[in-house]
């Protein structure tokens, strides 16, 4: 079976101030079993912006139910956007560990630019 | 329930150090980012530091910049204040506070620590 | 850097009669403003987020509106123990978070 890849068909999202961002992501297997997290920026400094398995994301919302076992599909919806939003999230992929989970692979990323709102 | 308790503060003399520590509990503390905010003997809040979920990414108030570090122990739950080269106007009670999202308010305080800088 | 000045510094009000606190930041922070509470001797508490959401467990006499760079925290008929300074605190800019100088509110 081919390795699982982590899928971010859009390189770039505009989004005006104060609406809904979507960010698509996909995997192509359910193998290895583990969570989705969603970060904002790369490296030691990256924003946890969604973790599947723990956590209230109260701004965040899951496109596909992701507790359906053949689910792949891990696209998010972030509602009122402001310009600290803008930036490029990663779709990570974690391989169930313990005790805790192992960063498996990341998609290439989307960046979201925000766009100001009209006044 | 939410809980933020903070430990360390006293007296000190300027030039001297000081850190404080915030112990958090009641929530996944690894997801959130935390902040110090302080507020100087009747005066308002002033906002010292911010630092991210994974602990990697760290924020300043100009005030503080290259004398305070903001760190975390995730496996310990617990949020922690550098402070160096304490001056009179560093005297304050310091709250450590929880985001209510990476990029949001401030959800829930802590009692506070009060840090006296004096000779 | 967002600037948000408060007013009045200092608010008398009976107890019953309506309080009206007002926040105006120096540049547009579209609905990302909460208020907080702070009593004498005490943490301060999240009262609004969002410009006019009420947190968990505060009393619906407490009301928040506003939007862009005006924005007003209404008490509908203040109690004895909602003597406190509020401040309200901007989050669509930051670094660095920005909070207002404070409107200290007295029951009569």
């Known amino acids: 079976e081919e390795e699982l890849q982590v899928i971010q068909p859009d390189k770039s999202v505009l989004v005006a101030a104060g609406e809904t961002a979507t960010l698509r992501c996909t995997a192509t297997s359910l193998i290895p079993v583990g969570p989705i997290q969603w970060f904002r920026g790369a490296g030691p400094g990256r924003e946890l912006i969604y973790n599947q398995k723990e956590g209230h994301f109260p701004r965040v919302t899951t496109v596909s139910d992701l507790t359906k076992r053949n689910n792949m599909d891990f696209s998010i919806r972030i509602g009122n956007i402001t310009p600290a939003d803008a930036g490029t999230y990663y779709c990570v992929k974690f391989r169930k560990g313990s005790p805790d989970d192992v960063e498996f692979k990341s998609g290439a990323g989307t960046e979201l630019s925000v766009r100001a709102k009209p006044s | 329930d939410v809980q933020l308790v903070e430990s360390g503060g006293g007296v000190v003399r300027p030039g001297e150090s000081l850190r404080l520590s915030c112990a958090a509990s009641?929530?996944?503390?690894?997801?959130?980012?935390m902040n110090w905010v302080r507020q100087a003997p009747g005066e308002g809040l002033e906002w010292v530091s911010r630092?991210?979920?994974?602990?990697?990414?760290?924020d300043y108030a100009d005030s503080v910049k290259g004398r305070f570090t903001i760190s975390r122990d995730n496996s310990k739950n617990t949020l922690y204040l550098q402070m160096n080269s304490l001056r009179a106007e560093d005297t304050a009670v310091y709250y450590c506070a929880k985001q209510y999202d990476w990029n949001s308010f401030f959800d829930y305080w802590g009692l506070g620590a009060l840090v006296t800088v004096s000779s | 850097e967002t600037v948000l000045t408060q007013s009045p510094a200092t608010l008398s009000v009976s107890p019953g009669e309506r309080a009206t606190l007002s926040c105006r930041a120096s540049q547009t922070v579209g609905s990302k403003l909460a208020w907080h509470q702070q009593k004498p001797g005490q943490a301060p508490r999240l009262l609004i987020y969002d410009a006019s959401n009420r947190a968990t467990g505060i009393p619906d006499r407490f009301s928040g509106s506003g939007s862009g760079t005006d924005f007003t925290l209404t008490i509908s008929s203040p109690q004895t123990e909602d003597s406190a300074v509020y401040y309200c605190q901007q989050y669509y800019y930051w670094p660095p978070y920005r909070f207002g100088g404070g409107t200290k509110v007295e029951i009569k």
């Open positions: 009641g929530f996944s503390f690894r997801s959130y980012a």
């Open positions: 630092i991210n979920s994974g602990g990697g990414g760290t």
